[in-house]
Structures are given as C-alpha cells and as structure tokens.
C-alpha cells in the first residue's frame, strides 16, 4: 500500500562540479523497518522485469554490506525515519533524477529527488527592497540555493569592488524544507550610493572567487545642491548687484520645484535656478539658500551669507550693569549696526571725549561715584563714521559717606540729663531711608536721624549711628562723657587681714568704683562725728571703745555718695570681771544665794570657772552659781574666771556671808 510511505525533502537540490550535495530527507514506512535501500540515478521502470533500471549509485542489503566504490555516495539514514544522503564530490553527470528505492518486509517505494549540477559555481542572487531611500536602513539579501557540510563557502559583500564595512549576517539552512546559504547586510545608504555597484561574491573556504551577483543601487534621494554666488565672497556694498546660481548635482527622482530662502523664509516669485539681486540694500544681508524638491522631499543647498556693507548706524550704549555699586566692575558696550564691523570707537562721558578708549567695550574695573553720568560713543568702519546716539546713564550707588554722630547738648552731660544726638552724612546714593544706633536702648527717635536719651545713665559711654540706604555706613562712636557722682562707695578693711583684736593696728579704706570727674574728697564719720578727710582711716592700737558703725563719703563736683555703715568689731579677752550676789552678799542660811560672774568680752565668754577662797575650783561652769539651800559653811570669798577665744580674765574676790537663821540661834 503505497500510501503508507511518507517522504519529506527538498524537491530540487543545486550544486556544481566538484562541490557536494547534502540531501536532508525523512520518511515513514508504517509496516516496519527498512530492509533494503538502493539509490538510482535516472531510474526507469522496466515493465518486463517489474524492476527499475538505471545507474546504481548506492546499495545496501539486509546483511549491511556496501560495495567499496560507493564511498562517494553515503546513506546517512536509518531503518525507520531518516533517509539523508550525501554525494561528495558531486559531478556534472550526477544531474538528473535520484531515485530512492525503499523496501520493507511487505512494501516497496521509489522516491524521486531532482539534482541540478552546473559546470561552474552558479551565482548567488541579490534581493533588494522595492525602494531604497537615503538614510533609511535597508537590508540587502544575497541568497544561494546551496549548502553542504562537506564544502564550506562564504558570501562577501563589495561596494564598487571594495569590501563593505558593515557586518553581514550569514545563515545556512539544511532542512527537509530548504537548502540555502544567505547573507544579510543592513546599511543606511546615502545619496552618493545611487548608481554604485554592489556585488555579492561567492567564495570557497580559502576566499577563492567562485561566482557573483551584481546590482547597481537605485537610491531615492532629495535633490543635492550647490550654490554659487557672484561675487564669490558674497561681500558687496549698498547699491551693488548680486547673482546666485543653484546647481542640482543629483536628484532621484527628477526635481519638480525650485525656490530661494533668506534666513529660512521663502522669497516670493523666485522660482528659477538664478537669483538676481539688483541694487542691494543692507536689509538684504542674510543667509541665502536654494531649495529644490522632488517626490522624496526638499533638498537645500549650503547657506551663502550675503554681507551688504554700510557705514555704522547711530550707536547705542549698553551698560553692564546700571545701577552699579561703587567698587564693582562695569562694562560699556558700543552697539552700532555696521558692515564691516567697526574698527574704531570714540567714547564720551558727559559729552567729553574719553582719552585712549577706542575699543567696542570699555571696562572700568573699580567704579567710583564720579564715574556716574551719561556715556555715548561713535563707531567707525572703512565706509564712514556713524552718529553719536542718545547715550546711556550710569548710576553709581554707594553707601552713605562721611557719617558722623553729633551731640546736640551743651557739655558736660550729667547723669540724668536728656541727651539729643543727630546722625549726619555727607552724601548718599540712593537716599538714606533709615538710621541705626548702637548700643540699642529703649530710646526715643523723635525724627529721622535724631536720637533722644531721657535720663542718661552714668554708664552711657559711647554712641554710634549708621545712615542706611541699601547699605549701612557706621559713624565712629562718639563719647557722651557723662559726668556723675562717685559710685559704689564702700568701706574696706585693709589691715589686719584677719579679725581685729584689741591692740591691733587697723587701717580702713574708703573705696569707690568710679567717678566723673575724677577729682574727689573723702570724709569719715562715726555716729555722726567727723573723723577724717583722707581715703584711709588708721588706728595705731585699737581698743574696744573704737568699735562701732563707721561711714565714709566721697564727693566730686557733681555730688557726694556715702558708703553703707560699716561695723568695726574689736575682739578682746574677758575684762572687768566681778562677782555679783543675789539677793545680796549677806544671806540667811537655808535660803537661796545666786552668784553671777559678770564680764565684758568680745566674743562673749564661752566658759566660766568658779573658785573659792582657797582658790579651789568649784564644779560649776555656768555664768551663775546657785547655792540652795545656802549654809553657813558657804560663807567666804569667791571669784570667777571667764574664757573666750581671745583669752581669760578673772574677777576680784567677793565675800558671801551666810548667817544663822533665828531658828538655829533659837536652838542654841
């Protein structure tokens, strides 16, 4: 059943003498494996023998034996699906039909494949896109209906016989659907590629030429133009004539329209290849080009810069920058339309020529107020001298100048006075808009630039003002020189350095922090009594009687100031001790008697000791010695000793007499 055999392979294979053929082939024999395979060349069926006649190129049998002369032809297939064949080398007389005679256990089949072998390598075929346009990337394809594993080939692209720089991508196909070698070249043609010869060259593995295909490129492009001008330098004077000619060096397809443009704008009624400009004016200066269009689009020539020369026009001055800040740099630019450009300039400041200034720009590195004013200029070129334009005003701004702080009061100023100051300046641009004062205080500014200080303080030493426009300028501080009575008067002990003991030499100093004016007088006073007029009060040997409250006064022409009362304390050992007895020095037995040790001491007595008439110390240490009940035996002389941090003192003897009570006398 012949329908069971299914083959797939290329219908025709192409090669040339000495090359090889690789025949990709697959089959399916549904009733089992292949048992016999014969490759015929131009097979013909013999009805008599019911067999095929023809040259047997290859034969394989059940036992798998292959005659040795069949090495040129190889069956690379298998027994059930692959029927790939190779003929290497292939010869011219191999052209024709190849017959694949297949036999399985029960079925037979003859499959035919066409083989076309040429005498010489056949040329590849260049495939071009239907249209090639400049600057648009295209792919050129070179196709060769040949590929064989045993015969490597290469396809090379040439432009005008020179290998093309662009990299080509080569691919091969050896499948049951197709056998080919293909090279694809991507490139962006320019207009100059139009008419140029592109070749795809087939070479063997060693680069030897085998065959080629050639095409001449048809590259569609916008018109390519050349512009010519008379005079050739395109420099004329007003009133001259100019001719411009537009030449089309290449256009594909043919051009259709011509126009002329000046500075990018189309010139009306100028549609020929020649542009005639008669009696040109300076307004006709500019960039000219011609534009020619075809179906691809418009092409433009290079621009011709037509320069119509004329004497300078009235000039204007541009200032960078006005207003200018004093000390900054300023540049003046003289602007005058002229062709050729001016070669010489004359500059004027407030109508007076500025010597040595002949350039287009004037640069002043450090602007001063006197630079202000009107600047104008005159430009000059080979065709003449221009007129002086209106000029430009330079405004020089600067901080207020020569600022001073002025005291309006009569001098001297006394503490507590009301002081008025004014802030003055010499000049300012822009005008002064505000004033500042240092130091800051809760002061009144009755008018701009005037400061009123009510009840001026003794310590208001200096005041400075600033006059401000865009900047503030400070005056040097002015001294108020406020006069005041001596301040911070106080008594200070100079010696001794430690506490004052009776008998010490003592010096007291009358101190003050400040006084204006400086000339002062001193006064010492104790309990309202004047003690001295020096700054120091001295005691050669201080006594407790000198203790007390002292004050010193310092006065100047403005007034006098007293110190706080200062207490002078003299330390001394207990003195003037005496024993006083209560209720008296004669007490009845059985009653209570209190002895008190009285003393004068600084600091007060801290410790008392009592003694009897035998100088025997008693076990009592307080100021009072209480005897209760008193006995006759208590009669006798007593004395006490007082102790403080300075020393000790003792009292004289005091006699206590204890007499018998009437009861005792009565018993006796």
């Amino acid at each position: 059943d012949s329908s069971k055999w299914v083959f797939e392979h290329p219908e025709t294979l192409y090669a040339w003498e000495g090359a090889c053929v690789w025949i990709p082939c697959t089959y399916r024999a549904l009733d089992g494996d292949l048992e016999s395979f014969i490759l015929f060349h131009n097979p013909e069926y013999n009805k008599n023998t019911s067999k095929f006649d023809g040259t047997r190129l290859y034969e394989s049998t059940k036992d798998g034996k292959v005659p040795s002369e069949q090495k040129r032809v190889q069956f690379l297939g298998d027994k059930n699906k692959n029927c790939t064949l190779s003929i290497h080398p292939v010869h011219l007389n191999d052209s024709g039909q190849l017959g694949l005679r297949m036999e399985s256990k029960t079925e037979k089949w003859m499959e035919r494949i066409h083989l076309n072998v040429s005498e010489r390598p056949f040329p590849p075929h260049i495939q071009l896109p239907p249209e090639i346009q400049e600057s648009q990337e295209v792919t050129l394809t070179c196709l060769l209906n040949f590929s064989c594993y045993g015969y490597p080939i290469q396809l090379q692209w040439l432009l005008e016989g020179v290998p093309m720089r662009q990299a080509a991508v080569t691919s091969t196909s050896l499948t049951i659907k197709s056998v080919f070698t293909r090279s694809e070249l991507k490139f962006s043609p320019q207009w100059s590629h139009h008419g140029k010869i592109v070749t795809c060259q087939l070479q063997d593995a060693d680069g030897k030429f085998l065959s080629n295909d050639t095409v001449q490129l048809n590259v569609k492009h916008t018109p390519k133009l050349e512009i010519k001008v008379t005079p050739s330098d395109a420099i004329v004077r007003e009133g001259d004539s100019v001719t411009m000619t537009c030449e089309v060096s290449s256009s594909n397809p043919e051009y259709t329209t011509v126009s002329w443009l000046k500075d990018g704008t189309s010139l009306k009624k100028q549609n020929t290849f020649t542009l005639n400009l008669r009696e040109v004016t300076k307004d006709q200066s500019g960039k000219y080009c011609c534009q020619v269009s075809n179906d691809v689009g418009p092409g433009r020539s290079e621009e011709v810069f037509l320069q119509v020369q004329y004497a300078p026009e009235p000039s204007t001055v541009q200032i960078l920058h006005s207003p200018a800040v004093e000390g900054s740099q300023v540049e003046f630019l003289c602007m005058s339309l002229a062709n050729p450009l001016p070669t010489n300039y004359t500059w004027y400041h407030n109508g007076k020529e500025m010597q040595g200034r002949t350039e287009e720009k004037v640069h002043i590195p450090k602007i001063l107020p006197w630079h202000a004013g009107t600047y104008s200029c005159v430009a000059e070129n080979i065709l003449g001298t221009g007129q002086r334009g209106p000029g430009a005003e330079l405004d020089v701004q600067y901080p207020p100048k020569k600022v001073t702080t002025v005291i309006q009061n009569p001098m001297p100023i006394r503490e507590g006075d009301t002081v008025t100051l004014s802030c003055n300046y010499n000049s300012s641009n822009p005008s002064v808009t505000r004033y500042e004062w240092k130091p800051h205080g809760a002061w009144e500014e009755p008018s701009l630039g005037v400061l009123k200080i009510q009840n001026v303080g003794w310590d208001n030493t200096t005041i400075a003002c600033a006059a401000c426009n865009s900047w503030c300028s400070w005056a040097s501080p002015v001294a108020l020189n406020v006069q005041y009575a001596p301040r911070d008067v106080r008594v200070r002990k100079i010696k001794p350095l430690s506490e004052i003991h009776s008998g010490n030499s003592v010096s007291l100093q009358c101190d003050f922090s400040s006084s204006h004016p400086k000339e002062v007088q001193f006064f010492w006073e104790k309990n309202g009594r004047l003690l001295g007029k020096e700054s120091q009060l001295n005691f050669d040997s201080i006594s407790p009687e000198d203790a007390g409250s002292y004050s010193c006064w310092v006065n100047n022409s403005i007034g006098q100031t007293a110190s706080k009362a200062w207490t002078l304390e003299v330390l001394y050992a207990p003195r003037r001790l005496r024993v006083s007895m209560s209720p008296g020095d004669q007490v009845m037995e059985g009653k209570s008697a209190t002895l008190t040790c009285e003393s004068d001491a600084n600091p007060p007595v801290s410790h008392y000791t009592w003694f009897d008439w035998n100088n025997q110390s008693l076990p009592y240490h307080s100021q009072k010695l209480r005897l209760e009940p008193v006995k006759v035996q208590h009669s006798g002389a007593y004395w006490c000793q007082g102790t403080n941090s300075v020393g000790k003192g003792r009292s004289p003897l005091s006699t206590l007499t204890v007499y018998y009570s009437p009861e005792t006398i009565g018993r006796r």
Epitope: L158, S192, G195, I197, D213, Q216, N218, E226, S250
Partner: antibody, heavy 109, light 106 residues
C-alpha cells in the same frame, strides 16, 4: 566577454521618431544600468539617460525630458532608446554604454 | 548636474613632448565610502567610440600604455601624456560618474 551591439544607421525626417536598440551579452543584463550617450559632429559627448533593467527605473537628462524614452526587454537582454519630435540638431552618433566596477563598455554607436 | 571644464580646448605638441590637460569639476567627485574619485579620461578618434584610458582619476585601464597617467582629487584633475607619440593625436574627454554622467567639452 561583455558586448553591446547597436542597431544600424537611421535617416529620419524632422518631427519623426527613432528607436535605437542595444543588445547586451556576456553579463547578467539586470545587474547593470544601461546608459545612452550621443555625440553630434565636432561636439562634446552628451549624456541622455539610463535604465535600470532590474526594475525599469529610468532617469533622463533634463534637456531631453519629454522627448526621450528608454526601455528594456529582459527576455532578449535588449535596451531601446526612442527619441521623438526629431530636429536637425538631433543628428548625432548615439551610443549605449554601461559601467563595470572599474571599466566602461560602449556600443559601436 | 555636475559640470566639467577642460583646458586647454586644443593644443599642438611634438612627438616626445610632455602634454598636460586639466579638468575642473563644479563639485567634488570624491566618493567617500570607498575613498575614490569618480572621474575617467577617454581618448576618441574620428568615427570611433570613446576608449577608456583612466578610471578612478588615476588608475590606468588594462592594456593602456604607461605614458598615460591621471592625478588629482575632489574638483581638480590632470591628465598627462609623459612622452607624446604620433598615434596619440585625438580628442580627450574627462567624465564624472559620481552622479549620472557628464563630460568635459574635450
């Protein structure tokens, strides 16, 4: 080898048309453009135009625009140049020619 | 189109002389893709088709005697016969083939 063989001499009346042929051999006809050039007696060579036989694309010198038609027959590898509205100043030798990469091939005229 | 101007328009010389013809192009004929000038020189004798002598401005065609040479680039080209021979009497044309074809006046 490359050969370009042209048709013979023609005599025409003013206002008539003429069609000159150029048979190419020795190369792939569609690979190269075929140009036409003429030369009047004692005058310079003057390019008329070309045809690209691959796609029948033509380009003409503007001075012949509207009077000249160049065609090609791929089957016979022959190019034709037809000039209409003939004037006496069209009297000239007409050449077909083509480029090679380095050389140029000319018909006999 | 690109215009070519040849000079001189005619000249007389003796056998053995060195002869120079110039050809000026209105635009450059240098094809930058291959760095070659698309200018050719032809010799034409009466009743004959033009014969190619030089292509690419300076390359001699096969079989052309070495006394013929060409030089130049861009827009200015020179054709030289180093030692004139009697059979060199002819009209010589320059031709540009960068963009269509144009010929010098010969």
């Amino acid at each position: 080898q490359v050969q370009l063989v042209q048709s013979g001499a023609e005599v025409k009346k003013p206002g008539a048309s003429v069609k000159v042929s150029c048979k190419a051999s020795g190369y792939v006809f569609t690979s190269y453009w075929l140009h036409w050039v003429r030369q009047a007696r004692g005058q310079r060579l003057e390019w008329i135009g070309y045809i690209n036989p691959r796609n029948d694309y033509t380009e003409y010198n503007r001075i012949f625009k509207g009077r000249v038609t160049i065609t090609a027959d791929k089957s016979t590898s022959t190019a034709y140049m037809e000039l209409s509205s003939l004037r006496s100043e069209d009297t000239a030798v007409y050449y077909c020619a083509r480029r090679g990469i380095t050389t140029f091939y000319w018909g006999q005229g | 189109a690109i215009q070519l101007t040849q000079s001189p328009s005619s000249l007389s010389a003796s056998v053995g002389d060195r002869v120079t013809i110039t050809c000026k192009s209105s635009q450059s004929v240098l094809y930058s893709a291959v760095e070659k000038n698309y200018l050719a020189w032809y010799q034409q004798k009466p009743g004959k088709a033009p014969k190619l002598l030089i292509y690419w401005a300076s390359t001699r065609e096969r079989g052309v005697p070495s006394r013929f040479s060409g030089s130049g680039s861009g827009t200015d080209f020179t054709f030289t016969i180093s030692s004139l021979e009697a059979e060199d009497a002819a009209t010589y044309y320059c031709k540009q083939y960068l963009s269509s074809w144009t010929f010098g006046q010969g």
